[in-house]
């Protein structure tokens, strides 16, 4: 990470094994204002690798509820509406930060998390390999 | 949220504002340990909707680098190489949670902040709006 | 549990189209499966024809593309096969069976199949 | 189209004997999600096929553990280590990371 000086008015921690525990502020600050974020909600239907959307619910997790992507075929959708094998319908995939519980239950105490989730699917052109 | 039961085994929080001020240990936990992130690291170039990756550099963020999407083309890729604009390239956009230094420069003290993000481009079908 | 069941001509005359129903019982076919029909010809040689989604979407074998249609009616739970334009190299048993499309993509349960013969 | 090539085309065993089928296909089966759908029926005398073995290794509900997939790439083995005369019959090796087809059968038989 970056040496960042430290500033007089910043909190105090007595945490003994600072820097690894900070204090957050879970009042969040939402920076999409200007971003419409449902203008991209139907592009699960109609993409030409279309995906479901299934809710994964984890009470010990913040955000709780997290959707991940699962893609429809495993070939790619054509203009006339056929499955083309020819083509492969892919999960993008980006790791996240949530934050866990722990220790579990507790209200008040997290631990940050990377969990890997698929947000959408796309159409790519697969790697052919020949046999000899 | 989901109310969860104080539990005795649990770290005390003395902050006036609890449960909105929490305790968060940055000794990140990752899950992904049984998924290879490298497979889908060539879908951007094999996309029918490829895409371009932005570095996003902010050191008052946690974590301070982000790679945003920017599709290539207004159009999909067809087999044959060329862009078919009778279809769309879009950006899938997901909402993520990062760490906000705050006060500025603290090393201890952060909030949590949602960010739009774009993922990737997939290729979507048009929505056309005839002329009456 | 979930049954699919055949019906439809067991003759056909060459150049007519072979129209064949599956009839779903126990499962939706709105439900994350694709529902398939798959034939089967003298000698054991198993060929796949095509499919229909839960979303309705369908996939046919390139080398029937011309000549094949999956349809479905969710109000009765049936799926169908039309097939034009038949020729005796036509004649085979002919199953519809389900395919758990969500995750392991394979066919996972077979009708008892219905035999037909294309001739004059 | 994918060609499935099983060998071999019959396969005379002993009950309680070990047999070996072998598939291969004329392209790679794993699919750019890195999954590889390589499945095998069995399909006995006078009934439709039931599969056994799904993406390679896995067994199908109810499917006795003396049954065992393996392989990678394009080339897959089918195994049952002890043959019971419930296992007669024809067995077909399966793709659908592409357009599906089916391999041309082993059938197993007593000797």
């Known amino acids: 990470g970056i040496a960042i000086p430290r500033n007089s008015g910043c909190p105090n921690s007595e945490d003994k094994n600072f820097p690894r525990t900070v204090m957050v502020n879970l009042n969040i600050h939402n920076r999409n204002t200007s971003t419409n974020p449902k203008r991209s909600s139907d592009y699960y239907n109609r993409s030409t690798s279309p995906w479901n959307l299934h809710r994964n619910e984890d009470p010990e997790r913040y955000p709780s509820v997290i959707w991940e992507a699962k893609c429809r075929h495993l070939g790619c959708v054509k203009a006339d509406g056929n499955v083309d094998y020819h083509m492969n319908s892919v999960p993008i995939q980006q790791e996240i930060l949530v934050l866990r519980r722990e220790p579990r239950h507790c209200p008040n105490s997290f631990r940050l998390e990377k969990i890997l989730v698929s947000v959408g699917c796309t159409c790519v052109t697969p790697i052919v390999h020949h046999v000899a | 949220g989901i109310a969860i039961p104080r539990n005795s085994g649990c770290p005390n929080s003395e902050d006036k504002n609890f449960p909105r001020t929490v305790m968060v240990n940055l000794n990140i936990h990752n899950r992904n340990t049984s998924t290879n992130p490298k497979r889908s690291s060539d879908y951007y170039n094999r996309s029918t909707s490829p895409w371009n990756l932005h570095r996003n550099e902010d050191p008052e963020r946690y974590p301070s680098v982000i790679w945003e999407a920017k599709c290539r083309h207004l159009g999909c890729v067809k087999a044959d190489g060329n862009v078919d604009y009778h279809m769309n390239s879009v950006p899938i956009q997901q909402e993520i949670l990062v760490l906000r230094r705050e006060p500025r420069h603290c090393p201890n003290s952060f909030r949590l902040e949602k960010i739009l993000v774009s993922v990737g481009c997939t290729c979507v079908t048009p929505i056309v709006h005839h002329v009456a | 549990d979930v049954q699919v069941q055949e019906s439809g001509p067991g003759l056909v005359k060459p150049s007519q189209s072979l129209s064949l129903t599956c009839t779903v019982t126990?499962?939706?076919?709105?439900?994350?499966?694709?529902w398939n029909w798959i034939r089967q010809f003298p000698g054991n040689k198993l060929e796949w024809m095509g499919y229909i989604t839960y979303s309705g979407t369908t996939s046919y074998n390139p080398s029937l593309k011309s000549r094949i249609s999956i349809t479905r009616d969710t109000s009765k739970n049936q799926f169908f096969l039309q097939l034009n334009s038949v020729t005796t190299e036509d004649t085979a048993t002919y199953y519809c069976?389900?395919?758990?499309?969500?995750?392991?993509?394979?066919?996972?349960?077979w009708g008892q199949g219905t035999s037909v013969t294309v001739s004059s | 189209i994918i060609v499935m090539t099983q060998t071999p085309l019959s396969l005379p065993v002993s009950l309680g004997d070990q047999a070996s089928i072998s598939c291969r296909s004329s392209?790679?089966?794993?699919?750019?999600?890195?999954?590889?759908?390589l499945h095998w029926y069995l399909q006995k005398p006078g009934q439709s096929p039931k599969l056994l073995i799904y993406?390679?290794?896995n067994r199908f509900s109810g499917v006795p553990d003396r049954f065992s997939g393996s392989g990678s790439g394009t080339d897959f083995t089918l195994k049952i280590s002890r043959v019971e005369a419930e296992d007669l019959g024809v067995y077909f090796c399966s793709q659908s990371t592409h357009f599906p087809t089916f391999g041309g059968g082993t059938k197993l038989e007593i000797k």
């Open positions: 392209q790679s089966l794993v699919h750019s999600n890195g999954n590889t759908y």
């Open positions: 069976a389900r395919e758990e499309y969500d995750d392991i993509y394979a066919v996972d349960y």
């Open positions: 126990g499962n939706s076919i709105t439900s994350y499966y694709a």
């Open positions: 993406k390679v290794y």
